[in-house]
Amino acid sequence: LADPLDHRDAGDLWFPGESESFEDAHVEHSISRSLLEGEIPFPPTS
């Protein structure tokens, strides 16, 4: 699948604003953002 979000404006995607009196920063926690950041998750310990 192609990345469905436009990389040119990835700085504040998925930022739905206030919810239950605080900000829900989806921008920092979306699948697309995780791909852009290129994080490598730690492998599970054996």
């Epitope: 504040d12 604003g17 206030e18 926690h29 979306s30």
Partner: antibody, heavy 114, light 112 residues
């Protein structure tokens, strides 16, 4: 390639329980907030549950229609999320999607009927 | 809850013509940082929803630029400038500003 694959759907009787699994791959999972959204036979989409990341203490949120009956959880080591569904009602009959709101799985059918 | 209503609920369009779908919210979707939390999805027959537009007017990557989104705090429009065969399906608006997150009832687009 990003993949979200839901499993565990079936035909169950009212009052019974069922557990759905969403296995993900192709992206760094641990920091991603995940959701379950369902689609009724009438094709209406309904957001039902949300789970945040470990850094957010795995905070969870639910739609009123499932609160107290459904539980969302995740296992970062398996890059999977789950939906434990108890006290199922006929109104819970739907296709259940695992999603990050940008990417969606293919969905799994849950039918609640006597 | 934030209720989203769509109009029309069904739409029949000749290929090559334009189409517009309206979505109205019962509450303002203008959040912090002046971001408007209105999203459009297309669900093609037998498929999962796919993202078209995010934050009211931003085109998701891979989506043809014949799609565009516009609106204000409570009234929104999805426009398809030249409808093609692959555009057939059900279009949903959604808001991710307040819990519970909500979706519109959908607009079914068919070809004449």
């Amino acid at each position: 390639e990003v993949q979200l694959v839901e499993t565990g759907g079936s035909l169950v009787q009212p009052g019974k329980s069922l557990k759905l699994t969403c296995a993900t791959s192709g992206f760094p999972f641990s920091n991603v907030w995940m959701h379950w959204v369902r689609q009724s036979p009438e094709k209406q989409l309904e957001w039902i549950a949300h789970i945040k990341a470990k850094s957010d203490n795995y905070a969870t949120y639910y739609a009123e229609s499932v609160k107290g009956r459904f539980t969302i959880s995740r296992d970062d080591s398996k890059t999977s999320i789950y939906l434990q569904m108890n006290s199922l009602k006929e109104d819970d009959t739907a296709i259940y999607y695992c999603t990050g709101l940008d990417y969606w799985g293919q969905g799994v059918m849950v039918t609640v009927s006597s | 809850d934030t209720v989203l209503t769509q109009a029309p609920l069904s739409l029949s369009v000749t290929p090559g013509e334009s189409a517009s779908i309206s979505c109205r919210s019962s509450k303002s979707l203008l959040g912090v940082r002046d971001i408007t939390s209105l999203y459009w999805y297309l669900q093609k027959p037998g498929k999962s929803p796919q993202l078209l537009i995010y934050r009211m007017s931003n085109l998701a990557s891979g989506v043809p630029d014949r799609f565009s989104g516009s609106g204000s705090e409570t009234d929104f429009t999805l426009k398809i400038s030249e409808v093609e065969t692959e555009d057939v399906g059900v279009y949903y608006c959604a808001q991710f500003l307040r819990y519970p997150y909500t979706f519109g009832p959908g607009t079914k687009l068919e070809l004449k």
